[in-house]
């Protein structure tokens, strides 16, 4: 947020940039939270735009019985690992095909025991305020589907008829990590010392970090003809004086006619 200064007063302005503002030769360059010629004003809204998507990662272990373990499988650049990865990925894509949040799998380690596959199931969803519920539901479906396939696709007489077969007892969910996004926390942090006065309000499922000085929200402060200004003690209305009236009161809703004051009379609207 920048305000340009022209003329002789500029040099004086340079030394007067407030709130961490820096002079660039023409104007005060203000930090995110401030604006104005001297960076003296506190912004009324802060962009905490959520990420477009939120991710989750499930750490799973399954035991594949239709492939015999060889040492080459430990080496991620070997042809053996690459072929195993291709088949395993195709199989898991089929298993999880009905889950819209499913992105793919990432094998982290293959070890002996037929082939014990340590892997991550990757999930992603568009950001909405309900993203946690959406991803929690998706992780439950992942558990159901992997349990089902590892119970159904099993070896019979040392032969597998499916793309892959599994050991029913070898399926484990180790850990679930969801990318944390807390708009309230982000809003508080970014508002710094004004954090007590900034709140998150939603519009079209998008969070807005605003102070009461931002118009058009349920917490907005109505200063009538005055101007809302944020200070460390909270939002305040700075009341204006017109040619005919003085305005006062917490929301500048009390107008006093000048002519009546000069005539020693007070008149309130």
């Amino acid at each position: 947020r920048t305000t340009t200064c022209f003329g002789d007063g500029c040099q004086n302005t340079a030394s007067r940039c407030k709130n961490g503002g820096t002079w660039d030769g023409l104007k005060c360059q203000c930090p995110n939270l401030y604006y104005g010629e001297l960076c003296e004003e506190v912004v009324s809204s802060i962009d905490i735009g959520p990420p477009e998507t939120i991710s989750a990662q499930m750490e799973l272990t399954v035991t594949v019985t239709s492939v015999k373990f060889t040492e080459e499988l430990k080496n991620h650049s070997s042809q053996e690992f690459q072929e195993f990865k291709q088949t395993f990925t195709e199989q898991m894509n089929i298993v999880y095909s009905g889950i819209p949040e499913y992105v793919g799998v990432n094998i982290t380690k293959l070890r002996l025991g037929s082939v014990v596959v340590e892997h991550d199931v990757l999930l992603r969803t568009k950001y909405t305020p309900e993203y946690k519920t959406v991803l929690d539901n998706a992780t439950e479906v992942v558990k159901e589907k992997i349990t089902k396939v590892t119970t159904q696709q099993i070896m019979i007489n040392d032969i597998c008829s499916d793309m892959m077969c599994f050991n029913t007892t070898g399926t484990q969910v180790q850990n679930i990590t969801v990318t944390q996004y807390d708009p309230e926390e982000d809003c508080r942090k970014m508002a710094k010392e004004y954090g007590d006065y900034f709140v998150v309000e939603y519009r079209d499922q998008k969070p807005y970090c605003i102070s009461p000085c931002e118009p058009g929200f349920s917490v907005s402060k109505n200063c009538n003809l005055g101007k809302c200004q944020m200070s460390l003690s909270g939002p305040q209305c700075l009341c204006v004086t017109t040619e005919t009236h003085w305005y006062s009161g917490e929301t500048c809703n009390q107008g006093t006619q000048k002519s009546l004051v000069y005539g020693h009379h007070h008149h309130h609207h």
Partner: nanobody, 123 residues
Framework: EVQLVESGGGVVQPGGSLRLSCAAS????????WGWFRQAPGKEREAVAL???????FYADSVKGRFTISQDNTKNTLYLQMNSLRAEDTAVYYC?????????????????WGQGTMVTVSS
């Protein structure tokens, strides 16, 4: 990348014999799994005979005692000796390979394929 080329297909009378060969390029012949699959018109591809580097072999019930799978590592070649051929053996026969030691009949688990050779058993 493993390249597989089948040969030896043809027309034979019921009860006759054929020997299919599959020549492989690359140095992977001594590892993994090798197999013969077939696909009859209008049917799914099915496993006929499989062999792995750990000595495991598999034969489909319909060919047991009639077909024999073998390999010559020095020539990088896989064979399928087919005896007592029947009309129901008519199909395109495919050679398949994987560097993995497989125990699966499902074609989707096999990574490398030849173009196929036609076997017709007819009187």
């Amino acid at each position: 990348e493993v390249q597989l080329v089948e040969s030896g297909g043809g027309v034979v009378q019921p009860g006759g014999s054929l020997r299919l060969s599959c020549a492989a390029s690359g140095d992977t012949f001594s590892r993994g799994s090798w197999g013969w699959f077939r696909q009859a018109p209008g049917k799914e591809r099915e496993a006929v005979a499989l062999i792995s580097s750990d000595g495991w072999t598999f034969y489909a019930d319909s060919v047991k005692g009639r077909f024999t799978i073998s390999q010559d590592n020095t020539k990088n070649t896989l064979y399928l000796q087919m005896n007592s051929l029947r009309a129901e053996d008519t199909a395109v026969y495919y050679c398949a390979a994987s560097v993995l030691v497989l125990r699966t009949l499902n074609p989707k688990a096999w990574h490398h394929w030849g173009q196929g050779t036609m076997v017709t058993v007819s009187s």
